[in-house]
């Protein structure tokens, strides 16, 4: 058993049918010695008396808010949560496996640049009685500071019969140098509590591996005289690291017909302009990627050919 | 420690091309190592990230773009002295700081070159003959060092009398390649910045 926060405790259970569970001793936080009784949640049934209460915690029915009283007055509370270990592996019931970039990916994180700021998100089908708390650091043995905000519900989607909820959090490394070569990964730890179930999820990454630039901005077309060709130009996104000559991007320019089946013409360039043939009803899209370290491509920025 | 904005004349920067070749070569070699050594811990998540140049060179600090010198987190400088005459410095305007930056890059390359050559000698003794260093990568390191053209004492190739542990050697190869790829990215960024300045 360990303390998650004041008066909230996590009991770790080897989870299998007929498991013996864990013996837990609760102590009433009071100078009083006599006349103390214990109850669980809203029930008025007295579970025991005395300054300490010994319980065998086996299932969720044994978890909850234990309260010690004296003469109708509440003295203190202890909330017991359960953390299930199923055949040597901690349970992952609360969050959905996003399966990207690989199986067992519960937390996904992205950064728009090298400033040390990043966003992580996760999915769940649970809509109520759910709380998250996020901590992060650079390295684990001698951790350096990363400050995370509160996790917020960022999107709701309908997936078949189920509703899916996306939560996200923004974090910022306290002293980040965009040009630094990372040798210790960022660690992100999310505590999830659903009703009386506790779970924790972790992700470990280098900022360089989670870079995904914003799409190029100010995408413009300039027709070339007496030609079906156009000059496409764009600019680096505002959120990208500066100076751009140091943090350079490479670009992919795509000409896509109205129908998805039509052949796509693609050009790769390090410049912020390209000359392409504009077909009728086609659209021109441009996306960006770090020129030297191949992490994710940005989303496409698009303009119609007409 | 920073780079001045007004440096070499346009088109006078032969090192950019070599640094791009270097990044391509080390990335290809790393990919090959990860595929060939699939039963070894060779992915970024599995290896320890060690920097053999740590406390010996200070490339990131010495080559910091001027715009980032205002960022206190970037000024964790380590004093290191370097020899400062190089042929990539194609303009008389080149400052001492830039010479320091390029000589730091040269020292990095020299250290990795020695490590890779020592390692290749061990790998050639492996009866499994599973993996060797790409000669193209070693040649590209050499070309960039020649383009930088710094006079520096030659570092003798390390020789080891004891029987090599091939498992450890292959893991060390993965660690070295990951670290060298990260340094090659920095070198490419620096060369691009200098070329644009």
């Amino acid at each position: 058993i360990w303390e998650l926060k004041k008066d909230v405790y996590v009991v770790e259970l080897d989870w299998y049918p007929d498991a013996p569970g864990e013996m837990v001793v609760l102590t009433c936080d009071t100078p009083e010695e006599d006349g103390i009784t214990w109850t669980l949640d809203q029930s008025s049934e007295v579970l025991g008396s005395g300054k300490t209460l010994t319980i065998q915690v086996k299932e969720f029915g044994d978890a909850g808010q234990y309260t010690c009283h004296k003469g109708g007055e509440v003295l203190s509370h202890s909330l017991l949560l359960l953390h299930k270990k199923e055949d040597g592996i901690w349970s992952t019931d609360i969050l959905k496996d996003q399966k990207e970039p690989k199986n067992k990916t519960f937390l996904r994180c992205e950064a728009k640049n090298y400033s040390g700021r990043f966003t992580c998100w996760w999915l769940t089908t649970i809509s109520t009685d759910l709380t998250f708390s996020v901590k992060s650091s650079r390295g684990s043995s001698d951790p350096q500071g990363v400050t995370c905000g509160a996790a917020t519900l960022s999107a709701e989607r309908v997936r078949g019969d189920n509703k899916e909820y996306e939560y996200s959090v923004e974090c910022q490394e306290d002293s980040a140098c965009p040009a630094a070569e990372e040798s210790l990964p960022i660690e992100v730890m999310v505590d999830a509590v659903h009703k009386l179930k506790y779970e924790n999820y972790t992700s470990s990454f280098f900022i360089r591996d989670i870079i995904k630039p914003d799409p190029p901005k100010n995408l413009q077309l300039k027709p070339l005289k007496n030609s079906r060709q156009v000059e496409v130009s764009w600019e680096y996104p505002d959120t990208w690291s500066t100076p751009h000559s140091y943090f350079s991007l490479t670009f992919c320019v795509q000409v896509q017909g109205k129908s998805k089946r039509e052949k796509k013409d693609r050009v790769f360039t390090d410049k912020t302009s390209a000359t392409v043939i504009c077909r009728k009803n086609a659209s021109i899209s441009v996306r960006a990627q770090d020129r030297y370290y191949s992490s994710s491509w940005s989303e496409w920025a698009s303009v119609p050919c007409s | 420690r920073n780079l001045p904005v007004a440096t070499p004349d346009p088109g006078m920067f032969p090192c950019l091309h070599h640094s791009q070749n270097l990044l391509r070569a080390v990335s290809n070699m790393l990919q090959k190592a990860r595929q060939t050594l699939e039963f070894y811990p060779c992915t970024s998540e599995e290896i320890d990230h060690e920097d053999i140049t740590k406390d010996k060179t200070s490339t990131v600090e010495a080559c910091l773009p001027l715009e980032l010198t205002k960022n206190e987190s970037c000024l964790n400088s380590r004093e290191t002295s370097f020899i400062t005459n190089g042929s990539c410095l194609a303009s008389r305007k080149t400052s001492f700081m830039m010479a320091l930056c390029l000589s730091s890059i040269y020292e990095d390359l020299k250290m990795y070159q020695v490590e890779f050559k020592t390692m290749n000698a061990k790998l050639l003794m492996d009866p499994k003959r599973q993996i060797f260093l790409d000669q193209n990568m070693l040649a590209v390191i050499d070309e960039l060092m020649q383009a930088l053209n710094f006079n520096s004492e030659t570092v003798p190739q390390k020789s080891s009398l004891e029987e090599p542990d091939f498992y450890k050697t292959k893991i060390k190869l993965c660690i070295l390649l990951h670290a060298f790829r990260i340094r090659a990215v920095t070198i490419d960024r620096v060369m691009s910045y200098l070329n644009a300045s």
Epitope: D14, W15, Y16, P17, D18, A19, E59, F60, K85, E86, D87, G88, I89, D93, K102, N103, K104, T125 | F39, P41, E46
Partner: antibody, heavy 115, light 112 residues
Amino acid sequence: QVQLVQSGGGVVQPGRSLRLSCAASGFTFSSYGMHWVRQAPGKGLEWVAFIRYDGSNKYYADSVKGRFTISRDNSKNTLYLQMKSLRAEDTAVYYCKTHGSHDNWGQGTMVTVSS
Amino acid sequence: SYVLTQPPSVSGTPGQRVTISCSGGRSNIGSNTVKWYQQLPGTAPKLLIYCNDQRPSGVPDRFSGSKSGTSASLAITGVQAEDEADYYCQSYDRGTHPALLFGTGTKVTVLG
């Protein structure tokens, strides 16, 4: 006393369907994940499928994906395996088992796919 | 399709020490715990070892398990006639959990 009692096995022709049941008692069935495992005559153990305690997630071996469906009825304390498009290579003894460090197995039920 | 490799058979005379190996990889045994089962002819498998080296109550102490890196082993110290059975190791793979990964199985024969 934890008990898993299986039923529903038998002889079936290729291409036909069969449903296996596994009745649980002696524990809170709705709190635990459940597996199906099979063993072809004279062969080793092969995992078939898994279902979470609440039925929210199901996982299948590639060899049965799209043909077999694992399900549970927590109000009846019963686990099911619906098998469709049966093939000769599905002939095996099928076991249900609880998920956890200490597990309990059903007695097994024989499924024979033969024309 | 078996990723965990066991020797097809091992044998010993009563009282001898018999060991069965189970060889896997970094993503399975290297990252997860190992179980061992005993299966007597015509019966369901019975758990002998869980969490690499833990014995459930009721399993004789002549059975012991161990794990090192990407392989595990089961030892029967002082093998007895009633130990003649098939033995299977089981683990999980990082990427496919909760799918059970079973070993190929080992037939233990007690001679004499």
